[in-house]
C-alpha cells in the first residue's frame, strides 16, 4: 500500500552489514505525489564506481544514483548527508555487498517522504494545452472563454463540430474567421444534400491561410474533404493549394479541420452548392441520343433510338428505341440496353426452290434463292437475292419482302422429238419429247399439263366423267408401267360454258368450245418426264397460218391397233378449214351438212396420212413459240375429225386464253397466290 513516509535501514544497522547480501526496498507514495529520499548516515565500503558494495536508487528504468563510502552533512542544522527528489510516486532502493570487507562498515540510514509535485512546472511536457492548475497531490487543466475541455481532461478546443448543412447553397468558415483559428481543435462539418445532387466546393486562394507543412511536407494544421471513399487534401499553407472548384461526385461531404497547439493563422472560408449529379455522355454504339447535349445531369431523360438495322431485344420481342434517365447516383438507367443488329432469322423455304444456308442472319446479310432448274424458274423476278433489312425482314430490291415464286418452265421438252421410222402415219415418241402429255384412262384420251395444278383437255373427254383418273410421266400406258408413273387426282372439272351438253353425246355434230380444265388436288412435281406446255400469247404473233407445223402426241388409235400402248407422235401442218369440211365423214351419225365448223377450230393434217385419231382427244397440238424457239405452246387441242388419217380439227386455244386465266385465277388456292 502506498505510504506518505518511511524509513530504510541497511541490514543489521547500526551494526556492520554482512557480506554477500542483496536487499531491495520498493517505495510507493500515493498518486500525484513525488518522493523525497534522504540519507542521514552513509558508511559503505568505497570502491571505484561503487563496484564492491553499494546502495542504488532506481526510478523506473533510470538510475537516480549509486552510493558508497562515508558521507557527512555539510549543513550543521541538517543531518542529511545525501538526498534525492523524484517527481514520480515509485522508487526502488537496492543494497548490495560483496564477499569481503576490509573494515567494519555500518551501512546506511535513509528516510522518504511524499512531497507534492507541481505537474504544471516540473515536467518538460506541459500536461495542459492551455491553463494548468496545481494542487497538493494533483493538478487540473482549464480553458479560456469559448473553449471547452476535451474528454482527456487535458486539451482544450473550440466547439466547432456537429453542424449539418442541407441547403443547396451555403458558406462555411473556420472558427473566428478571419481572426486566428483556435489551436488544438478538430472541427467537423457535414454537408448532406438530396440524392441526385453533388456537392461542389469553391474556394479563393486568398481566403485560405493555415499553418504551413513541416520540413517533411506534413501539414501541422490541415483541412480535409471526404466524400464517400474519395478524399481531397489534406491542405495547408498560405493560399489554397488545391483546385479552386472541387466536384465531389457525392451528395454527402465531410469537412475536417484539424489544428495543433501552435500557430496563429486566419484560417479559411469556402462556399458550396449542390449541382445536379452529372451522368457521363456515353458512347452507345449504333444509336442516336435525343436531345443531344454537351452535358447531362440528374433527372435528364434521353430517348435512345437504334440506327436502322439495329434493335433492343428482350426475349422474343424487340424495340427500336428506349428511354434512359440520369439517376441520382450519376449513372444512366437502362444502361444495359444495347442496340444490336436486327436478326432476320432463318429465311423461309420456298416450293420448288432452295435458299443457301446463310453465313449470318443479321442486318445487312445477303441470301440467294434459286429455283430447281431447268424445270422451274423465278416467276416474279428480282433475281432471288435478298438482304436482311432494318425491319427484320429479308427484302428483295424488286419484290420487297415477298418471297420468290418458282414456277414450272413451260414448253421445253427434255429431249426434242425426232421422227424416226415411219409407223403408219406417225412415229414412236418418248414422254421426254412431250412431258406435258397427260393420259386419261376413262375415256381413253389425252390432255396437256399447263401448270402444277391444271390440266387442259377437250370438253368431250370429261363431260361423261367428272372425276377422271390421269397419269403423267410415262411413255407406256401398260398397267404395270402406269403403276410406276404419277397418278393425278382431280379436284374439280371446269367445262367451257359454251360447250353444249347433250343427252346422247354420241350423236354430236357441234364440237364448238371443246375445251375443259381439270383442277388437281395436289401440285405436280416437275422433272424430265413431267413439265407443262405453254399457253399461246394473245398477240397476233400467235395467229396460225396455213402450213405452220405442229406436233401431236397420244396413245390413240393407229392403223394397226385400236389403242397404242407406247406414245406416238406426228408433225403436221395447219390447213385451211375448208380442207376439213371437204373430207367425207367416215361413220356419219347425221347429215354431213349438220357438222359445225367455227373460227374456234383449227384444221391440220392431210400430209402423208398423219393425223390424230380416237383416243388422242384432248392432247395438245404443240407449235413452236414464235417469240422463243426453244419453247412449244398449245395452239390446239385434239377435238374431232371427219376421218382418221386425213384432216383433224383442233380447238383453237388462243381464243380461250382469257377464260383459262380467269378460271384458274378464280379457283386458285392460297398456296398458289
Amino acid at each position: 500500500e502506498p505510504t506518505m513516509y518511511g524509513e530504510i535501514l541497511s541490514p543489521n544497522y547500526p551494526q556492520a552489514y554482512p557480506s554477500e547480501v542483496e536487499k531491495s526496498w520498493d517505495i510507493e507514495v500515493p498518486e500525484g505525489y513525488g518522493i523525497h529520499l534522504y540519507f542521514t548516515h552513509l558508511d559503505i565500503e568505497l570502491s571505484e564506481n561503487c563496484a564492491y558494495d553499494s546502495v542504488q536508487i532506481i526510478s523506473g528504468d533510470t538510475e537516480e544514483g549509486r552510493l558508497c563510502g562515508q558521507r557527512s552533512s555539510n549543513n550543521p542544522h541538517s543531518p542529511i548527508v545525501e538526498e534525492f527528489q523524484v517527481p514520480y510516486n515509485k522508487l526502488q532502493v537496492i543494497f548490495k555487498s560483496d564477499f569481503s570487507n576490509e573494515e567494519r562498515f555500518t551501512g546506511f540510514a535513509a528516510y522518504y517522504v511524499a512531497t507534492d509535485i507541481n505537474e504544471c512546472t516540473d515536467f518538460v511536457d506541459v500536461p495542459c494545452s492551455h491553463f494548468c492548475n496545481n494542487f497538493i497531490g494533483g493538478y487540473f487543466c482549464s480553458c479560456p472563454p469559448e473553449y471547452f475541455l476535451h474528454d482527456d481532461m487535458k486539451n482544450c478546443g473550440v466547439n466547432c463540430s456537429g453542424d449539418v448543412f442541407t441547403a443547396l447553397i451555403g458558406e462555411i468558415a473556420s472558427p473566428n474567421y478571419p481572426k486566428p483559428y483556435p489551436e488544438n481543435s478538430r472541427c467537423e462539418y457535414q454537408i448532406r444534400l438530396e440524392k441526385g445532387f453533388q456537392v461542389v466546393v469553391t474556394l479563393r486562394r486568398e481566403d485560405f491561410d493555415v499553418e504551413a507543412a513541416d520540413s517533411a511536407g506534413n501539414c501541422l494544421d490541415s483541412l480535409v474533404f471526404v466524400a464517400g471513399d474519395r478524399q481531397f487534401g489534406p491542405y495547408c499553407g498560405h493560399g489554397f493549394p488545391g483546385p479552386l472548384n472541387i466536384e465531389t461526385k457525392s451528395n454527402a461531404l465531410d469537412i475536417i479541420f484539424q489544428t495543433d497547439l501552435t500557430g496563429q493563422k486566419k484560417g479559411w472560408k469556402l462556399r458550396y452548392h449542390g449541382d445536379p449529379m452529372p451522368c457521363p455522355k456515353e458512347d452507345t454504339p449504333n444509336s442516336v441520343w435525343e436531345p443531344a447535349k454537351a452535358k447531362y445531369v440528374f433527372r435528364d431523360v434521353v430517348k435512345i433510338t437504334c440506327l436502322d438495322g439495329f434493335e433492343v431485344v428482350e426475349g422474343r420481342v424487340g424495340a427500336t428505341s428506349f428511354y434512359s434517365t440520369c439517376q441520382s447516383n450519376g449513372k444512366w438507367s437502362n444502361s444495359k440496353l444495347k442496340c444490336q443488329p436486327v436478326d432476320c432469322g432463318i429465311p423461309e423455304s420456298i416450293e420448288n426452290g432452295k435458299v443457301e444456308d446463310p453465313e449470318s442472319t443479321l442486318f445487312g446479310s445477303v441470301i440467294r434463292y434459286t429455283c430447281e432448274e431447268p424445270y422451274y424458274y423465278m416467276e416474279n423476278g428480282g433475281g432471288g437475292e435478298y438482304h436482311c433489312a432494318g425491319n427484320g425482314s429479308w427484302v428483295n430490291e424488286v419484290l420487297g419482302p415477298e418471297l420468290p415464286k418458282c414456277v414450272p418452265v413451260c414448253g421445253v421438252p427434255r429431249e426434242p422429238f425426232e421422227e424416226k421410222q415411219r409407223i403408219i402415219g406417225g412415229s414412236d415418241a418418248d414422254i421426254k419429247n412431250f412431258p406435258w402429255q397427260v393420259f386419261f384412262d376413262n375415256p381413253w384420251a389425252g390432255g396437256a399439263l399447263i401448270n402444277e395444278y391444271w390440266v387442259l383437255t377437250a370438253a368431250h373427254v370429261v363431260e361423261g366423267n367428272r372425276e377422271p383418273t390421269m397419269y403423267v410421266g410415262s411413255t407406256s400406258v401398260q398397267t404395270s408401267r402406269l403403276a410406276k408413273s404419277k397418278m393425278l387426282t382431280p379436284e374439280h372439272v371446269f367445262i367451257h360454258p359454251g360447250w353444249k351438253l347433250l343427252e346422247v353425246p354420241e350423236g354430236r355434230t357441234n364440237f364448238d368450245n371443246d375445251i375443259a380444265l381439270v383442277r388437281l388436288k395436289d401440285p405436280v412435281k416437275m422433272g424430265p418426264t413431267v413439265s407443262p406446255i405453254c399457253l399461246p400469247g394473245t398477240s397476233s404473233d400467235y395467229n396460225l397460218m396455213d402450213g405452220d407445223l405442229g406436233l401431236i402426241s397420244g396413245w390413240g388409235r393407229t392403223e394397226k391397233r385400236d389403242r397404242a400402248v407406247r406414245l406416238k407422235a406426228a408433225r403436221l401442218p395447219v390447213a385451211p378449214l375448208r380442207k376439213c369440211k371437204e373430207v367425207k365423214v367416215e361413220k356419219p351419225t347425221a347429215d354431213a351438212e349438220a357438222y359445225v365448223f367455227t373460227p374456234n377450230m383449227i384444221c391440220a393434217g392431210g400430209e402423208k396420212g398423219m393425223d390424230s385419231c380416237k383416243g388422242d382427244s384432248g392432247g395438245a397440238f404443240a407449235v413452236q413459240d414464235p417469240n422463243d424457239k426453244t419453247k412449244f405452246y398449245a395452239a390446239g387441242l385434239v377435238s374431232w375429225g371427219p376421218q382418221c388419217g386425213t384432216y383433224g380439227l383442233y380447238t383453237r386455244v388462243k381464243n380461250y386464253v382469257d377464260w383459262i386465266m380467269k378460271t384458274m385465277q378464280e379457283n386458285s388456292t392460297p398456296r398458289e397466290d
Partner: antibody
Framework: QVQLVQSGAEVKKPGASVKVSCKAS????????MHWVRQAPEQGLEWMGW????????IYAQKFQGRVTITADTSTNTAYMELSSLRSEDTAVYYC?????????WGQGTLVTVSS | DIQMTQSPKSLSASVGDRVTITCRAS??????LDWYQQKPGQSPKLLIY???YRYSGVPSRFSGSGSGTDFTLTISSLQPEDFATYYC?????????FGQGTKLEIK
C-alpha cells in the same frame, strides 16, 4: 426456361427486418435489372427499387430510402431484398421481376406479415 | 415522382364487349408505358409494352395506344379469361410508378 423462384412467407414483429430471396434460372441475372415490387392486401403495385447485378448499382424509391437494401449474388444467380424497421403497413406480397425493356418475368411473390 | 392515374377504378362488362381503360401520367412519359394484367393470387403478366406493342403470346384482342400523358388499353371482345385487374406503369424515369389499377368484373 426463365423462372424466378422466391423464398417462403415470413411473419415478423414491428421493428424487425426481413430478407427475401429471388433465385433466377434460365438466364444470367448479370444481363438484366432485377426489380422489387410490393403489393399490400387489396392494393395496387408499388415499385421499390432495382439492382444491376453486374456492378451492384442500385436505385431505390424515395419512400423506401434508408430502409431497403437490394443486393445480388451473381455466383448463385440470386437477388435479395431486405427491408428494415418493419411496421404493420409493410404487410404485403413482395415480388421480384426481371427487366431490360419491361417487366417480362415475375417471381411468384412472398407474403411478409408484420404483426406484434 | 410521376403519378399515374387510371380510370375507371372498376368496370363491369359482359363477354364479347369492347372495353377501354385509360391511364394518365402527371407529366410527359413519351411512349414509355406498359400494361399488365393481374388475376387474384397470381403475379402480374405483361400485355403491352412501349404503349402499343403487344407482348409475344398476348391475344390480338388486346391493343394499346397513346403517347405523352394519355394512354388507353382496349380489349376488342372480352373473353371469360380477361376478367382481372389491369395496371399501367411508366418506365420513362425512376421511380417507375404504377397506376392504382382497374378491376374488370363480369356484369
Amino acid at each position: 426456361q426463365v423462372q424466378l423462384v422466391q423464398s417462403g412467407a415470413e411473419v415478423k414483429k414491428p421493428g424487425a427486418s426481413v430478407k427475401v430471396s429471388c433465385k433466377a434460372s434460365g438466364f444470367n441475372i448479370k444481363e438484366y435489372y432485377m426489380h422489387w415490387v410490393r403489393q399490400a392486401p387489396e392494393q395496387g403495385l408499388e415499385w421499390m427499387g432495382w439492382i444491376d447485378p453486374e456492378n451492384a448499382d442500385t436505385i431505390y424509391a424515395q419512400k423506401f430510402q434508408g430502409r431497403v437494401t437490394i443486393t445480388a449474388d451473381t455466383s448463385t444467380n440470386t437477388a435479395y431484398m431486405e427491408l428494415s424497421s418493419l411496421r404493420s403497413e409493410d404487410t404485403a406480397v413482395y415480388y421480384c421481376a426481371r427487366s431490360r425493356l419491361f417487366f417480362a418475368y415475375w417471381g411468384q411473390g412472398t407474403l411478409v406479415t408484420v404483426s406484434s | 415522382d410521376i403519378q399515374m392515374t387510371q380510370s375507371p377504378k372498376s368496370l363491369s362488362a359482359s363477354v364479347g364487349d369492347r372495353v377501354t381503360i385509360t391511364c394518365r401520367a402527371s407529366q410527359d412519359v413519351r411512349t414509355a408505358l406498359d400494361w399488365y394484367q393481374q388475376k387474384p393470387g397470381q403475379s402480374p403478366k405483361l400485355l403491352i409494352y412501349s404503349a402499343s406493342y403487344r407482348y409475344s403470346g398476348v391475344p390480338s384482342r388486346f391493343s394499346g395506344s397513346g403517347s405523352g400523358t394519355d394512354f388507353t388499353l382496349t380489349i376488342s371482345s372480352l373473353q371469360p379469361e380477361d376478367f382481372a385487374t389491369y395496371y399501367c406503369q411508366q418506365q420513362y424515369t425512376t421511380p417507375y410508378t404504377f397506376g392504382q389499377g382497374t378491376k374488370l368484373e363480369i356484369k
